[in-house]
């Protein structure tokens, strides 16, 4: 299907942080579409030539994935139809920090939103009762 530059959909992201060595989530939601096959999700990172992740026609399409994310990304495939484009990032690295863009194309149009992702060695605060 063709998308003209005149149609836009709402895409929403939330800034987040990832613990080095653990798995992280980059949150992104969008106006859902009726057909999964009409939804394309593309995750980008500023400064990176390849894609972080691509999901289209109901499955991952990783032919253009950048080397630094190979084998480390996944979307929640069963939740895409309800507008969840969040990305799971495995084994978070210090170098994963930066600005990401969640790009969405549906039959209604396209949209994108940026999010800042911080990485570090974070610990849960101790609570003394």
């Amino acid at each position: 299907f063709g998308i003209s530059g005149r149609h836009s959909i709402t895409v929403t992201t939330v800034a987040s942080a990832g613990n080095i060595g653990e798995d992280g989530i980059l949150s992104c939601t969008f106006e859902p579409d009726i057909k999964l096959s009409d939804i394309v999700i593309q995750w980008l990172k500023e400064g990176v030539l390849g894609l972080v992740h691509e999901f289209k026609e109901g499955k991952d399409e990783l032919s253009e994935q950048d080397e630094m994310f190979r084998g480390r990304t996944a979307v929640f495939a069963d939740q895409v139809i309800v507008g969840n484009a969040s990305l799971r990032l495995k084994n978070v690295q210090l170098t994963d920090a930066g600005t990401y863009k969640c790009y969405i194309i549906t039959s209604k149009g396209k949209g994108n939103a940026n999010l800042e992702y911080k990485t570090g060695a974070f610990s849960m605060p101790e609570v003394n009762v």
Partner: antibody
């Protein structure tokens, strides 16, 4: 402020070699892919080569493949272009530029002129 | 390699005119297209990426549209500082080819 400053251009004979440098400042150099783009006198833009932030992936235009080598030293915040077996048609202003999103380029350096002539 | 074809190669226009430049890719590039402005003796400047997303600091009179193989750059009301050469570039696949350029001149 993000800045890119090219150097190393000059006059070289056909068949000769030259190494261009691009000094980067104002951003985390190792997080960004970098590119070389050239412009022959009075002509349009020609993408020459690109390299990923880590230096692990390199890309070339067919016109320079096997003759030019792109590299980077992230500890020195510097991008390089080693040009061998130079030809008259390589005469151009060479710009370095930073990857923004995918291969869209921003900002660009001011350029350095390479003149291949006998 | 993906070939990029711009039209027209040059055009003459007056201040206040609406100007449209087109770019065609030899194969589907989705919306991975960028537009640049270059003035004589200066480095190019990124205007638009992702076919329609305005780069930060670029005036809103510039807009981009299209997807697949056909793309358009529009200047809604030409200003004196807009007289320059404009290039499209596909940013989906190496080699990241440019169009041949469109020179916008004063009528």
């Amino acid at each position: 402020e993000v800045q890119l400053l090219e150097s190393g251009g000059g006059l070289v004979q056909p068949g000769g070699s030259l190494r261009l440098s691009c000094a980067a400042s104002g951003f985390t150099f190792s997080s960004y892919g970098m590119h070389w783009v050239r412009q022959a006198p009075g002509k349009g833009l020609e993408w020459v080569s690109g390299i990923s932030g880590s230096g692990g992936s390199t890309y070339y235009a067919d016109s320079v493949k096997g003759r030019f080598t792109i590299s980077r030293d992230n500890s020195k915040n510097t991008l390089y272009l080693q040009m061998n077996s130079l030809r008259a048609e390589d005469t151009a202003v060479y710009y370095c530029a930073r990857t923004q999103w995918r291969a869209s380029l921003d900002p660009w350096g001011q350029g350095t002129l390479v003149n291949v002539s006998s | 390699d993906i070939q990029m074809t711009q039209s027209p190669s040059s055009l003459s226009a007056s201040v206040g005119d609406r100007v449209t430049i087109t770019c065609r890719a030899s194969q589907d590039i989705s919306y991975w297209l960028a537009w640049y402005q270059q003035k004589p003796g200066k480095a190019p400047k990124l205007l638009i990426y992702g076919a329609s997303t305005l780069q930060s600091g670029v005036p809103s009179r510039f807009s981009g549209s299209g997807s697949g193989t056909d793309f358009t750059l529009t200047i809604s009301s030409l200003q004196p500082e807009d007289f320059a050469t404009y290039y499209c570039q596909q940013t989906t696949m190496s080699p990241y080819t440019f169009g041949q350029g469109t020179k916008v001149e004063i009528k």
